[in-house]
Interface confidence: low
């Protein structure tokens, strides 16, 4: 039975050029997480593996840095960076768990940093 | 130290196929993904495609659908099916290895091994 929960870093903005951290947390159950892949749409970003560590996209690799802890930094925004973002946690014996972060590119400086964590 | 050895290039008509394989030696045991680049004359190196111990597999744009990364991680050896070859996959093709040391980035690489597409 799964018992735990993802947290998440909710629906974020930053601004365009800008570096933002996409952070989740599962909480709420003592699976050992085996896994988590961080996923853009259809596209793998990033993995860390419990005994392997971090894998960067090659594609990602001069924008995305991995960390803190297992969340994502991605640098140099683009517009084209608004869009899904989904964390997933392999964990055993649960299973998955799939987080879900929403986050908005801006042109402006009107985007707002925010940090807070929601139960999607 | 971990060596890299290329093979499987040659010459090869427009639409044709070729099989590369990269054999990995030495001390493999923190090689967790292996990629393959090519550089053509005259122009950077460039990523290909790249595999992650247990099946991940990235490709560039302009390889998708074309070119099939493997790895064969009991011969630790890596593989590129390129199929529907075209002229401008012309170039020396170079293998790596991905160590997730503190870099992140591909290193060391092989000799390459040419690969011509021509009629």
């Known amino acids: 039975m799964m018992t735990g929960t993802i947290e998440t870093t909710g629906n974020i903005s930053a601004e365009k050029g800008g570096s933002i951290i996409l952070q989740c947390h599962l909480s709420s159950t003592t699976a050992q997480v085996t896994q988590v892949n961080w996923e853009q749409q259809d596209q793998l970003l990033a993995i860390c593996n419990a005994d392997l560590g971090w894998h960067i996209s090659p594609s990602f690799k001069d924008r995305v840095a991995p960390g803190p802890g297992l969340g994502l930094t991605l640098q140099s925004l683009t517009v084209n960076d608004t869009g899904e973002y989904f964390c997933i946690y392999h964990t055993y014996p649960d299973g998955t768990y799939t987080g879900r972060i929403f986050l908005e590119v801006l042109e402006s400086s009107v985007a707002e940093h925010g940090a807070r964590f929601q139960i999607p | 130290e971990v060596q890299l050895v290329e093979s499987g290039g040659g010459l090869v008509q427009p639409g044709g196929s070729l099989r590369l394989s990269c054999a990995a030696s030495?001390?493999?045991?923190?090689?967790?993904?292996m990629g393959w680049f090519r550089q053509a004359t005259g122009k950077e190196r460039e990523w290909v495609a790249s595999?992650?111990?247990?099946?991940?597999?990235w490709y560039a744009d302009s390889v998708k659908g074309r070119f099939t990364i493997s790895a064969d991680n009991s011969k630790n050896t890596a593989y590129l099916q390129m199929n529907s070859l075209k002229p401008e996959d012309t170039a020396v093709y170079y293998c790596?290895?991905?160590?997730?040391?503190?870099?992140?980035?591909?290193?060391?690489w092989g000799q390459g091994t040419l690969v011509t597409v021509s009629s």
């Open positions: 595999v992650l111990r247990g099946g991940y597999t």
């Open positions: 030495g001390s493999i045991d923190r090689i967790n993904a």
């Open positions: 790596a290895r991905d160590s997730y040391s503190t870099s992140f980035w591909f290193d060391p």
